[in-house]
Interface confidence: low
């Protein structure tokens, strides 16, 4: 065992090159100088090291930089980044957007891993702010990242970033966030034709105001119930029975199943019962026939 730790004669690495792929793990450990590895990290990614060999290289870097890697090394980690744990990454101070891009590229096409989440957390905290370039980068790699931002942070997201968003990326957005994202989406998709526009805007409608819902009801969009249930209650309440019927099209029948849930429940309470009866769905809870409906919001505006 003792002699195995010494580098065999003539095997000492002078540079990081492809010859190293033929080294056994112990030879890499013994024959590759950690400082040399650190200065030539950019070459590692081009060499088809095995996962076991990458473990050795990581171990060497860990010994050289016990307090965390410098950014010059981090930027060139390449696939070695996949070997890092969140604990390793917490030691880093990443301030360059180029470094962030390089590491996100390694994980491209995969879900956001704990490593990536930690990296982004370190980056944002290291920079002290979420500037437009950072947001552009993060939303390009992880459109779903939008939903982890506060409305204030979202206010600096350019509408161009919205194009990369898939419906599932907005699953974790709450109404506050959709209030900010919806106008951007409306702007981004405004030049599309009716049916194409609805397909793109649908995921953002949780932030839509009443007047936009009224406009959509005139376009034969056939909104599904799942989308309708995510609409803002205050935006749905002023819609008439006829407008909801046009908005939902054949999906209007689904209102019965949702009559006890918001926003359907609250909307029903605002409608005349005889109007609800025209739907033929047996929806109950509307304003009884013959009752006077006072528009209190209009009354407040006048007083």
């Amino acid at each position: 065992e003792v002699e195995k730790t010494a580098c065999p004669s003539g095997k000492k690495a002078r540079e990081i090159d492809e010859s190293l792929i033929f080294y056994k793990k112990w030879e890499l450990e013994a024959c590759v100088d950690a400082a040399l590895l650190a200065t030539q990290m950019d070459r590692v990614n081009a060499i088809p090291f095995t996962y076991e060999q990458l473990d050795v290289l990581k171990h060497k870097l860990d010994e050289l930089y016990p307090q965390g890697y410098p950014e010059s090394v981090i930027q060139h980690l390449g696939y070695l980044f996949l070997k890092m744990s969140p604990e390793d990454i917490r030691k880093w101070n990443v301030t360059s957007l180029e470094t962030l891009k390089a590491l996100l590229e390694v994980n491209k096409g995969h879900e956001m891993s704990p490593q990536v989440a930690t990296l982004i957390d370190r980056f944002v905290k290291g920079r002290g702010q979420l500037d437009k370039d950072t947001l552009d980068t993060l939303t390009a790699f992880y459109p779903g990242y939008l939903c982890s931002l506060s409305p204030e942070e979202l206010s600096s997201v350019p509408p161009s970033s919205i194009w990369a968003v898939r419906p599932q990326d907005l699953d974790t957005c709450d109404p506050r966030q959709l209030d900010v994202l919806y106008p951007k989406a409306r702007l981004a998709f405004q030049n599309m034709n009716g049916s194409e526009y609805f397909v793109k805007i649908q995921s953002f409608l949780g932030g839509a105001p009443t007047e936009d819902l009224k406009a959509l009801s005139q376009q034969n969009v056939s909104m599904d119930l799942a989308t309708f249930m995510k609409l803002r209650t205050d935006a749905v309440l002023p819609l008439t029975v006829a407008e909801v019927q046009k908005l939902l099209g054949p999906h209007v029948e689904g209102l019965k199943a949702e009559e006890r849930h918001r926003p359907v429940r609250d909307w029903i309470l605002r409608q005349r019962q005889d109007d609800l009866d025209t739907l033929g769905l047996g929806l109950q809870g509307g304003i009884p026939n013959g009752y006077l409906v006072l528009d209190l919001s209009m009354q407040e505006a006048l007083s």
Epitope: G128, S148, S150, E152, E153, S155, T172, D174
Partner: antibody
Framework: ELQLVESGGDLVKPGGSLKLSCAAS????????MSWLRQTPDKRLEWVAT????????YYPDSVKGRFTISRDNAKNTLYLQMSSLKSEDTAMYYC???????????WGQGTTLTVSS | DIQMTQSPASLSISVGETVTITCRAS??????LAWYQQKQGKSPQLLVY???NLADGVPSRFSGSGSGSQYSLKINSLQSEDFGTYYC?????????FGGGTKLDIK
């Protein structure tokens, strides 16, 4: 070292008002959302208010909406909570906390005590 | 509002043992969950965010797991400094609410 230090807690009569302050240091205050939380005598934790980094957005639970106002002075690295129409159920230890990258709270102050009693 | 239910409410356990605390949300919170530790007379401290991510400086004996509406915090080989009260908190839209807490006592 990251630090949040609350002050201003007191004994107040029901219906009264009080303003709490939180002095922040050790991080870029103006880049972080901030919150007030409270812990009632029975040890329950409740979120009270949140303000975004630039101070343009504020959020409150229904229990304090219209009575409490969160604000911040980024030049002074200070967070405030103005409380009015106080009720006995507002009696609690009040903490200021920094918002993480999501809406969790990654650093808390040591707290300041508000007692509402006649 | 989303209700967070923690169990058990209290637990007596010995140093070196493993403990699991659970938190149930009244609806799907999509991993939007944090765990905090609070020691007697101190303020809460973040342990875990987004269900599984350990906060800075938290020992690796702590781990978070779960999805949908069910989450848990596991502490392996309990140390004396781990005793205190643990809270879960969802951040799936306002109002953000906390569980009632789980008090960990030394047996």
């Amino acid at each position: 070292e990251l630090q949040l230090v609350e002050s201003g807690g007191d004994l107040v009569k029901p219906g009264g008002s009080l303003k709490l302050s939180c002095a922040a240091s050790g991080f870029t205050f103006s880049s972080n959302g901030m919150s007030w939380l409270r812990q009632t005598p029975d040890k329950r934790l409740e979120w009270v208010a949140t303000i975004s980094s630039g101070g343009r957005y504020t959020y409150y639970p229904d229990s304090v909406k219209g009575r409490f106002t969160i604000s911040r002075d980024n030049a002074k690295n200070t967070l405030y909570l103005q409380m009015s129409s106080l009720k006995s159920e507002d009696t609690a230890m009040y903490y200021c906390a920094r918002r993480g990258i999501y809406d969790y709270f990654d650093c808390w102050g040591q707290g300041t005590t508000l007692t509402v009693s006649s | 509002d989303i209700q967070m239910t923690q169990s058990p409410a209290s637990l007596s356990i010995s140093v070196g043992e493993t403990v699991t605390i659970t938190c149930r949300a009244s609806e799907n919170i999509h991993s939007s969950l944090a765990w905090y530790q609070q020691k007697q007379g101190k303020s809460p401290q973040l342990l875990v965010y987004a269900a599984t991510n350990l906060a800075d400086g938290v020992p690796s004996r702590f781990s978070g797991s779960g999805s949908g509406s069910q989450y848990s915090l596991k502490i392996n080989s309990l140390q004396s400094e781990d005793f205190g009260t643990y809270y879960c908190q969802h951040f799936w839209g306002t109002p953000w609410t906390f569980g009632g807490g789980t008090k960990l006592d030394i047996k």
